[in-house]
């Protein structure tokens, strides 16, 4: 019988008492084969973290700073359940740490030196740890003691709870630095008042502070937020302009064998029986013998943290950067206005080899990081392990939902002004063998399908989106008799046609021979009835243009396109016979890397782009013998985006809507995780 006990860790007598009450009340409402609670008492949260890591306990609820400690080796814990606040309809699991300024003050985030600062309190998250952590490498050296460095950075501050004797500048705006509400500038409202009264130039608070203190929109309009990219935004745009997004209170468990499903089952049942306004005799979110025992008293319920989400992703790049800076106190030696090498994310070993060659030729400008799937690469860019990669539009959508931004677009047509003219896109098509003359768009049911990969534009999002509108369900593996759609579940019929060996079967990378445009076309040639690819795929792999044995004798005339009106046309008539126009592939990165990635890639393409004529004797960035490694092989240049610099603007309203409709069919664990952080 599996052990269905969750050992909850308590950190005080009062918590232990509430835990026992929780245990007893759960026993009374849950069947004997359901989850149960046991209580483990430890002296501190850090002791609880260690106990969970050592398998002496299973769960504890932590503030963000402790979630970071819990994640660090050797603890390796992960977030599994989040408390939410507000309503069930609009649950808030995060708050945003922001820098508020007066509208007419005219300085940016990178011009805070010499300004006067208002903090909620020394050592507090939004008011101190996050802003000072993010500014850490701009502080004057020596950076220890930290208070002295901060005092020398700003021209005056109010940092309640600081030592006014040792660091008088930190108490300059609020004499005495009192550590309670007796100090008018203490806490969130106090720090905002410090700005409002004109004592300070910037207040470090949370996003809700402004709304709680200024009910009137006209009053709020006198203030702005400082953004990390050195712009400003209105105070209601905090989701796009904050210092960090911080989880409020989170249940953590072991990463391996951590009982996360059991913990969720327990807490989900607990909130049903003992949540807000559920029961008189025991309340989960109430602490008669103290405050915030086991859970925050202000919590309204629990949400399951998506399984793909580790602590780094949950806490977010900015928060992790801030806390790591404060804890480790290390800063790069290079001057911050100089670009560090761009860490390119390469998929599996084929791309890694090309990336390595690029790295050798780039003389220190490009480094390489490997991952097995595109989603793993996106996650690495999010958390700072990698910086950039070029993505199909379907993944630009996922990357965008995860906070990344497009920075340059692949262009596929030769023009005089390639780098300045981003193209409208390419065509997604359905290709069939000419010999299968009875096959049309309207009778694909039961046929064998070939896809570039799940989640990609031409190979999946466009054809499956159109199909979904027709069949109104997501069981595409039942619609086609079998197929190869790399990235599908291994036991799906949409992996049956794939050719990868062993663990590489149906993997969404080049270890699967039927992956990508060329792979999907090969799948059609060898096994399938229809391939969903781009309009250039057939000409690029026929007429001897692809020397591989399977392709070298192919003839373009032996293939036709399926049109949406039920007719068929020759391959060259793609402009009048396609499924949809697809946005070009684009390079994505984190917002903080945008300028450097743009600068370095433009230098790199001038050195190794399509201006290089002899690729046998020189490194060529846009060539890999039809394998589309790192970039599509038909890329002519990487073009500026001008104002299309968000994923929505880049992909266009129509495509974003189409992918949004397919979301109900999405198997993307990363998309699920990212929409948890930003619904």
């Amino acid at each position: 019988v599996p052990d269905k006990t969750v050992r909850w860790c308590a950190v005080s007598e009062h918590e232990a008492t509430k835990c026992q009450s929780f245990r007893d009340h759960m026993k009374s409402v849950i069947p004997s084969d359901g989850p149960s609670v046991a209580c483990v008492k430890k002296a501190s949260y850090l002791d609880c973290i260690r106990a969970i890591a050592a398998n002496e306990a299973d769960a504890v609820t932590l503030d963000a700073g402790l979630v970071y400690d819990a994640y660090l080796a050797p603890n390796n814990l992960k977030p599994v359940v989040a408390e939410f606040y507000g309503s069930k309809e609009d649950p808030q699991t995060f708050y945003y740490a922001v820098a508020v300024v007066k509208k007419d003050s005219g300085f940016q985030m990178n011009q805070l030196r010499g300004k006067k600062s208002c903090h909620t309190g020394l050592g507090r998250s939004a008011g101190w740890n996050i802003p000072i952590g993010l500014l850490y490498c701009d502080l004057p050296e020596p950076r220890k003691p930290l208070e002295k460095a901060v005092a020398n950075f700003f021209s005056g501050s109010c940092a309640p709870c600081a030592d006014g004797t040792d660091f008088p500048q930190l108490c300059q705006l609020c004499p005495g630095c009192g550590c309670s509400t007796l100090n008018q500038y203490f806490g969130y409202s106090g720090a905002f008042k410090c700005l409002k009264d004109g004592a300070g130039d910037v207040a470090f608070v949370k996003h809700s502070t402004i709304f709680e203190n200024l009910a009137n929109k006209a009053d709020r309009d006198q203030y702005e937020l400082l953004c990390l990219d050195n712009t400003r935004k209105p105070v209601d745009e905090y989701k796009d302009c904050h210092l960090a997004q911080v989880p409020s209170h989170t249940v953590v468990a072991r990463s391996m064998g951590g009982k996360e499903d059991l913990i969720w089952e327990l807490l989900n049942q607990a909130q049903e029986h003992f949540g807000k306004d559920k029961s008189k005799e025991f309340q989960l979110f109430s602490s008669p013998h103290g405050k915030d025992l086991l859970f925050k008293d202000s919590a309204h319920g629990f949400l399951k943290v998506p399984p793909r989400m580790d602590a780094k992703m949950y806490l977010g790049y900015e928060y992790v950067t801030a806390i790591r800076n404060l804890r480790e106190g290390t800063c790069p030696e290079a001057p911050t206005d100089e670009c560090k090498p761009v860490k390119w994310c390469a998929l599996s070993h084929h791309e890694r080899l090309k990336c390595d060659e690029w790295s050798v030729n780039s003389v220190g400008k490009i480094e390489c990081v490997s991952a097995e799937t595109t989603e793993d690469c996106i996650a690495k860019i999010m958390n700072g392990e990698a910086d950039a990669m070029s993505l199909d539009g379907g993944f630009v959508y996922i990357a965008g939902k995860c906070g990344l931004v497009p920075v340059l677009a692949e262009n596929y047509n030769k023009s005089d002004n390639c780098e300045d003219t981003p193209e409208a896109g390419y065509f997604a098509i359905a290709v069939v063998k000419k010999s299968a003359s009875d096959l049309t768009w309207d009778n694909l049911k039961g046929k064998k399908s070939c896809h570039t990969a799940v989640g990609r534009t031409a190979g999946w999002n466009i054809p499956m989106g159109l199909l979904y509108n027709k069949i109104n369900h997501c069981r595409f593996d039942e619609f086609f008799s079998e197929g190869c759609a790399p990235g599908s579940k291994k036991d799906s019929s949409l992996c049956k046609l794939c050719m990868g060996s062993g663990l590489n079967l149906c993997e969404p990378n080049n270890k699967e021979g039927y992956y990508g445009y060329t792979g999907a076309f090969r799948c059609l040639v060898e096994k399938g009835d229809v391939a969903f690819v781009k309009h250039q795929t057939v000409p690029q792999n026929t007429g001897g243009k692809n020397p591989d044995p399977w392709a070298k004798n192919l003839n373009e005339k032996d293939y036709e396109l399926l049109c949406l009106d039920g007719t068929r046309k020759p391959v060259e008539e793609y402009a009048n016979c396609h499924l949809a126009r697809a946005p070009n592939h684009a390079v994505v990165t984190r917002k903080d890397k945008e300028a450097c990635v743009h600068k370095i890639l433009r230098q790199q393409q001038h050195l190794f782009g399509s201006n290089v004529t002899d690729c046998s004797g020189n490194f060529c960035l846009f060539r890999s013998e039809t394998k589309d490694l790192l970039f599509r092989d038909d890329t002519v240049c990487l073009a500026k985006l001008h104002d299309r610099n968000t994923y929505e603007k880049y992909l266009g309203e129509e495509y974003v809507k189409a992918v949004g409709n397919l979301r109900k069919c999405s198997t993307s664990s990363l998309l699920e995780a990212c929409t948890f952080r930003r619904p």
Partner: nanobody, 117 residues
Framework: QVKLEESGGGLVQPGGSLRLSCAAS????????MAWYRQAPGKQRELVAG???????KYADSVKGRFTISRDNAKNTVYLQMHSLKPEDTAVYYC???????????WGQGTQVTVSS
């Protein structure tokens, strides 16, 4: 297609030196990039050092200051001089010219380097 053959490996004590050679069956003058990789048991193959046609070099952080890559176009050979060897340098060392490895696994036999006392 140039064939590459690695040699020069062997058993060496920690702190010792070895010089690996990679001899090409044809001219390497026009080859854009040559590199040494290594693969330890149960680990991924990793780049150790690379050299461009113009002589620019790149090294893995773990070997910087200890290993030197060079190419002698006249002898159609690429070398890897290894000093201050450590047990963690134990691996099979392979040479590549990147010409076909992007899309096919064209690796030679490699040469075994074992660092042990």
């Amino acid at each position: 297609q140039v064939k590459l053959e690695e040699s020069g490996g062997g058993l060496v004590q920690p702190g010792g030196s070895l010089r690996l050679s990679c001899a090409a069956s044809g001219s390497i003058v026009s080859i854009a990039t040559m590199a040494w990789y290594r693969q330890a048991p149960g680990k991924q193959r990793e780049l150790v050092a690379g050299i461009t046609r113009g002589g620019s070099t790149k090294y893995a952080d773990s070997v910087k200051g200890r290993f030197t890559i060079s190419r002698d176009n006249a002898k159609n050979t690429v070398y890897l001089q290894m000093h201050s060897l450590k047990p963690e340098d134990t691996a099979v060392y392979y040479c590549t010219d990147y010409s076909r490895t992007y899309y096919e696994d064209h690796w030679g036999q490699g040469t075994q380097v074992t660092v042990s006392s």
